[in-house]
Interface confidence: low
């Protein structure tokens, strides 16, 4: 039985040419992370193997970087990086948790969090 | 273990130039955005550069565009800074730094500028 | 360019004491982009709390961050020997990326 919980950035703004960090937190279960991909629609952009370490894609390399934790940093954002994240655990004996971040990227200086992530 | 170990440091007269050296190991140093940040005399942290993980971005404050220079080596898990036209207010200890926000700093070396 | 202002410059707490220090920005900046580093005597400086309220990995309990707008601030709920450092505050969205001028939290 899949007992845990991913909580996840939500909803989410930054402004054009800033960063994100991108954060989702598994809890209540204890089961093992194996690995965690990150995924932009139907796109790759890293993954965090337990045992391997990070692989970023290459095609987001100058982009994106692993961390804190877990989580990813989008970098020198554009209009076209709007839309959804996910995040998926792969656990063991779990099976699959996803997340779901959308992330818009504004013109405006006044981009700020519609909600924010806060580990428990 | 992540070490970040900082080179090149020293004594330079005004308008002098100097080239510091940050030998990374313990990670995929081509996966992260690296960066220098000194230290002041009055413990001042100040912000210096910033490189994209595959090198094809650099950013600097205004203070030192056009005088420094950040660069790196993927193959050889090496960062570098170039300072040149060197003033006294460039005194400070610069730390080679992992990531942004930065998570992992090395010890620092130490820069003089003076006659 | 954003301005980080931290008070006070420097305090002093007892053991058990509840320590708070604040970071004022210049003008309103996103809690996503508000982190702070703890940096002790002949040491480089820690990663300690990341995008206002997350801890870093390794951080006691005792260590709480919060704020929105253009006041942030870092609390510890009891203070301890070890907690006695330099707390720095830092903005980093766009370039420039700034510091505060750090706080000096001693022990009393």
């Known amino acids: 039985m899949m007992t845990g919980t991913i909580e996840t950035t939500g909803n989410i703004s930054a402004e054009k040419g800033g960063s994100i960090i991108l954060q989702c937190h598994l809890s209540s279960t204890t089961a093992q992370v194996t690995q965690v991909n990150w995924e932009q629609q139907d796109q790759l952009l890293a993954i965090c193997n337990a045992d391997l370490g990070w692989h970023i894609s290459p095609s987001f390399k100058d982009r994106v970087a692993p961390g804190p934790g877990l989580g990813l940093t989008l970098q020198s954002l554009t209009v076209n990086d709007t839309g959804e994240y996910f995040c998926i655990y792969h656990t063991y004996p779990d099976g699959t948790y996803t997340g779901r971040i959308f992330l818009e990227v504004l013109e405006s200086s006044v981009a700020e969090h519609g909600a924010r992530f806060q580990i428990p | 273990e992540v070490m970040l170990v900082e080179s090149g440091g020293g004594l330079v007269k005004p308008g002098g130039s100097l080239k510091l050296s940050c030998a990374a190991s313990?990670?995929?140093?081509?996966?992260?955005?690296m960066s220098w940040v000194r230290q002041t005399p009055e413990k001042r942290l100040e912000w210096v550069a910033t490189i994209s993980g595959g090198g094809g971005d650099t950013y600097y404050p205004d203070n030192v565009k056009g005088r420094f220079t950040i660069s790196r080596d993927n193959a050889k898990n090496n960062l570098y800074l170039q300072m040149s036209s060197l003033r006294s207010e460039d005194t400070a200890l610069y730390y080679c730094?992992?990531?942004?926000?930065?998570?992992?700093w090395g010890q620092g070396t130490t820069l003089t500028v003076s006659s | 360019q954003i301005v980080l202002t931290q008070s006070p410059a420097i305090m002093s707490a007892s053991l058990g004491e509840r320590v708070t220090m604040t970071c004022t920005a210049s003008?309103?900046?996103?809690?996503?982009?508000l982190h702070w580093y703890q940096q002790k005597p002949g040491s480089s400086p820690k990663f300690w709390i990341y995008?206002?309220?997350n801890m870093a990995s390794g951080v006691p309990a005792r260590f709480s961050g919060s704020g929105s707008g253009t006041s942030y601030s870092l609390t510890i709920s009891s203070m301890e020997a070890e907690d006695a450092a330099t707390y720095y505050c830092?903005?980093?969205?766009?370039?420039?990326?700034?510091f505060g001028g750090g706080t000096k939290l001693e022990i009393k």
């Open positions: 995008s206002t309220s």
């Open positions: 830092h903005y980093y969205h766009r370039s420039p990326y700034t």
């Open positions: 003008s309103s900046v996103s809690s996503t982009y």
């Open positions: 730094a992992r990531s942004l926000p930065v998570d992992f």
């Open positions: 313990g990670f995929t140093f081509s996966f992260y955005t």
